[in-house]
């Protein structure tokens, strides 16, 4: 089956202190290799969250990607701040044998746009 | 069939104001996010603002931030842009511009209103 | 923001003839790019999305191509009504949503 990442939602407004998820499915799981979360693109991208195990403060996975044959690769920001505003990107990589992982597929990008919290 | 009408354009002095309207039809206004969109004379198309269907998340371009502001009224099915601070450079045909529902591309756009800004 | 720089500036050719345009991104935008049309006095269409997808209407004559950072709009035969300026835009690094300088395609 093609590969593709969906990111249903284009933008989410989510109120500063609360939390938010940021959709990700994939048709595919092949080629092997891991999926991860980054905010915005090119040299200035910062990682958000990767499914490969290690601890990121605030962002979780939705479901259990350790499922066999788990498509969603969703993730949850908790306690939002007006500083994660952005474009986040859901991207899939392919494992390489020696060298550094290849990108090789990407959602089209969930914009978060953080509201003042209600007083 | 879509619609988009605009309208308020005209010439103005450098440093005043001038309120721009899109009438749409054909669609579910409320379930669309709405742009505008601008061309200068002899120069190339410029993305100016955006804002969500349910007016809550909006972005503008770096050289009308501050300056312009976009908002709609889903009652009325009409899109407005408020340009304040008008500079010679605003000079353009001012497109107003729907989204489609899915990704940040153009499905219908309107036919365009001129804006000269001029001493 | 990602700049999209378009090529040629203008493209002379007869009707009948093959037109090749190229959209070029300063970083890669998947396949997350379109292709618009413009005539003077008229809105602009619509013509590709998604980098190869046609538009509703749009006649196969049009097609795109490329992934990436290199993209190409092709109009297999130029008729009468395809001499107009092409814009391609990419919706993957945004905000800011950018578009590409325009391609001019004139009658020789």
């Known amino acids: 089956k093609e590969l593709k990442v969906t990111q249903p939602e284009k933008s989410v407004s989510v109120a500063a202190g609360d939390s938010t998820v940021l959709n990700c499915t994939l048709t595919s799981l092949l080629p092997v290799g891991p999926i991860k979360w980054y905010r915005g693109v090119g040299q200035s991208r910062l990682l958000i969250y990767s499914f490969t195990g290690e601890h990121f403060p605030r962002v979780t996975n939705v479901s259990d990607a350790t499922k066999r044959n788990n498509m969603d690769f969703s993730i949850r920001i908790s306690n939002v701040t007006p500083e994660d505003a952005g474009t986040y990107y859901c991207v899939k990589f392919q494992k390489g044998p020696s060298e550094p992982d290849t990108e090789i597929q990407s959602g089209g990008g969930t914009e978060v746009y953080v509201l003042a919290k209600p007083s | 069939d879509v619609q988009l009408v605009e309208s308020g354009g005209g010439v103005v002095r450098p440093g005043e104001s001038l309120r721009l309207s899109c009438a749409a039809s054909?669609?579910?206004?409320?379930?669309?996010?709405m742009n505008w969109v601008r061309q200068a004379p002899g120069e190339g198309l410029e993305w100016v603002s955006l804002?969500?269907?349910?007016?809550?998340?909006?972005y503008y371009a770096d050289s009308v931030k501050g300056r312009f502001t976009i908002s709609r009224d889903n009652s009325k099915n009409t899109l407005y842009l408020q340009m304040n601070s008008l500079r010679a450079e605003d000079t353009a045909v001012y497109y107003c511009?729907?989204?489609?529902?899915?990704?940040?591309?153009?499905?219908?756009w309107g036919l365009g209103t001129l804006v000269t800004v001029s001493s | 923001e990602t700049v999209l720089t378009q090529s040629p500036g203008t493209l002379t050719l007869s009707p009948g003839e093959r037109a090749t345009l190229t959209c070029r991104a300063s970083?890669?935008?998947?396949?997350?790019l379109a292709w618009y049309q413009e005539k003077p006095g008229q809105a602009p269409r619509l013509l590709i999305y998604g980098a190869s997808s046609r538009a509703t209407g749009i006649p196969d004559r049009f097609s795109g191509s490329g992934s990436g950072t290199v993209f190409t709009l092709t109009i297999s035969s130029l008729q009468s009504e395809d001499f107009a300026v092409y814009y391609c835009?990419?919706?993957?690094?945004?905000?800011?949503?950018?578009f590409g300088g325009g391609t001019k395609v004139e009658i020789k």
């Open positions: 835009q990419q919706y993957y690094d945004r905000p800011p949503l950018t």
């Open positions: 804002i969500s269907g349910s007016g809550e998340i909006i």
């Open positions: 054909g669609f579910t206004f409320s379930s669309y996010d």
């Open positions: 511009a729907k989204e489609n529902n899915r990704y940040r591309f153009f499905d219908d």
């Open positions: 970083q890669s935008v998947y396949t997350y």
